[in-house]
Interface confidence: low
């Protein structure tokens, strides 16, 4: 094996076509040098992935009750920088870097309870705005998915996580505007809301509506309202969800994790930091032999597809041995 | 053999301050999440706070945010809990514990928050 | 809610199998780990991320966490297993918040 030195703060493998790791991957409870050599005569328990249960472990080379992956590395187990195209938020959801969070339509008519209900169950909560650009960022999305767009032309209003609270009924109606969940303090409220059409007499709450006006030519206006509505009555809504970690495949992962982020190579491995891949290493593939012209698979860490006109369509670039 | 070696508990009054340390050795401390537990007389554990590796991150149980801050000096191996406006319910053994899950815990210092 | 419940006590003779259980919410999402502490002393790690054991630990612990549930069970319990043990995992509600269930006094009848 050819001499070669690790960088400050990386871990030589004694063995194996792995040559250097991070150095807190030593001792960490998972081998991931091919001879186990980090695991070896370490004095302590090593670290457990911190709790979550979603995710592929990748320096395992095994999913969670899965089949080995084809996770096969050559040389140094490189660190990259990532950019912005990896993903932070699941398929269908808007990501905003200003809150780093994701938000979603749900075009489904609920009422405000159980559209609360169902944003909780994704993770999330109905949406509060902590800044004008936030709420602008918001307006801007085309929301629409192609198939449901009349549903969303018809029913242009959000439930989002405020209340109206009424305080007097004297010559009108007096309140003020709360945030319906407990969350984030830096919110801002809302101004004087438009009030629906009919409302009860008993209602001492009701709930937030804003409304989008998504015709293209007033789109770039902002333009849009807020309504207090009788928060049994039946809307599509928007949920609001801090930024995560995602993966190829589109699986949400948990802090601490290793995962291969969504973006355009599947030979990144990372850890998952508040919702950002950290300290992430991409392996090195051997080209495959005995083909000139080869495609990578755009899923599949150094699996090729071979575009000679009589070569083999599907090469792995390792060799047998080194599995 | 990790060794999380505590000082710092005492009797205090109510409103006062006090600060807890935990001194790490046998493991690459710098690598590691570390949290602080506490367990009321007869009571049983909870969850206090937790600060990551590098000491950017911190979290609070809801019952302390704002009175105690976490912290660390990786250069020592030592974790810290300031405990700040004290109130006759923080009285409790406090435990230091390394890492999420934690694996290896302090001994435990009592801290008595009496007038 | 973002709670784990325990049973506060459980008894089992000398060389049987207990299983002690923790439910949970956010134990659907997240791995669960197993203290046990005994009288004065600081709490003790027998399981993480559901089953595994850390070394030192005797192959008599075992995990596991099904749906809203996780179990510790002791197979051939032996005297010095009397203590309470306690659940913990993250909560759902507070991703780095962390979450311990009331415990579970286990009592070892000769």
């Known amino acids: 094996r050819p001499e070669l030195r690790c960088n400050p703060g990386q871990f030589a493998c004694h063995g194996g076509t792995i040559q250097c790791i991070p150095l807190p991957w030593q001792c960490d409870g998972w081998p991931t040098c091919e001879d186990k050599s980090d695991e070896a005569d370490c004095p302590v328990t090593g670290e457990a992935r911190p709790y979550g249960k979603e995710t592929v472990d990748l320096r395992q080379g095994r999913a969670r009750g899965g089949d080995p992956t084809h996770f096969h590395t050559v040389n140094v187990a490189q660190p990259v920088r990532f950019s912005s195209f990896l993903g932070k938020c699941p398929s269908g959801w808007h990501h905003y870097e200003g809150t780093a969070s994701c938000y979603r339509v749900y075009l489904s008519g609920e009422n405000y309870w159980d559209a609360a209900q169902t944003c909780q169950r994704v993770n999330g909560s109905l949406a509060t705005f902590s800044t004008d650009q936030e709420l602008r960022f918001v307006l801007a999305q085309e929301w629409d998915q192609p198939e449901r767009s009349f549903g969303w032309k018809d029913q242009r209003k959000l439930w989002v996580g405020y209340q109206y609270v009424i305080t007097g009924r004297n010559h009108s109606l007096e309140g003020r505007w709360e945030v319906a969940f407990k969350g984030s303090p830096e919110v801002f409220l809302p101004p004087d809301p438009i009030f629906a059409s009919a409302m009860s007499e008993n209602d001492n709450v009701f709930c937030a509506q804003l409304q989008c006006f998504h015709f293209p030519t007033l789109r770039h206006h902002d333009l849009h309202s807020w309504h207090a509505e009788s928060c049994s009555e039946k809307s599509s809504f928007l949920c609001k969800r801090s930024q995560t970690c995602v993966d190829i495949k589109d699986n949400v992962v948990d802090e601490g994790f290793y995962f291969t982020p969504k973006g355009d190579d599947p030979c990144l491995s990372c850890t998952c930091h508040r919702g950002e891949p950290e300290m992430c290493v991409a392996a090195l593939c051997e080209r495959p032999q005995g083909c000139q012209q080869y495609r990578k698979d755009p899923k599949e860490c150094c699996k090729f597809m071979c575009l000679d006109p009589d070569g083999s369509s599907l090469f792995d670039s390792m060799a047998s041995g080194m599995r | 053999e990790v060794q999380l070696q505590q000082s710092g508990g005492g009797l205090v009054q109510p409103g006062g301050s006090l600060r807890l340390s935990c001194a790490a050795s046998e493991f690459p401390f710098s690598s590691y999440a570390m949290s602080w537990v506490r367990q009321a007389p007869g009571k049983g554990l909870a969850w206090v706070s937790a600060?990551?590796?590098?000491?950017?991150?911190?979290y609070y149980a809801d019952s302390v945010k704002g009175r105690f801050t976490i912290s660390r000096d990786n250069s020592k191996n030592t974790l810290y809990l300031q405990m700040n406006s004290l109130r006759a319910e923080d009285t409790a053994v406090y435990y230091c514990?390394?890492?999420?899950?934690?694996?290896?815990w302090g001994q435990g210092t009592l801290v008595t928050v009496s007038s | 809610s973002s709670e784990l419940t325990q049973d506060p006590a459980v008894s089992v003779a000398l060389g049987q199998t207990v299983m002690i259980t923790c439910q949970g919410h956010s134990l659907r999402s997240y791995y669960a780990s197993w203290y046990q502490q005994k009288p004065g002393q600081a709490p003790l790690l027998v399981i993480y991320g559901d089953n595994r054991r850390p070394s030192g630990i005797p192959d008599r612990f075992s995990g596991s966490n099904s749906g809203n549930t996780a179990s510790l069970t002791i197979t051939g319990t032996q005297a010095e297993d009397e203590a309470d043990y306690y659940c913990?995992?993250?909560?759902?509600?507070?991703?780095?918040?962390?979450?311990f269930g009331g415990g579970t006094k286990l009592t070892v009848l000769s």
């Open positions: 600060i990551s590796s590098s000491g950017g991150d911190t």
């Open positions: 514990a390394k890492n999420w899950n934690l694996d290896y």
């Open positions: 913990n995992s993250r909560d759902s509600s507070g991703h780095h918040n962390v979450l």
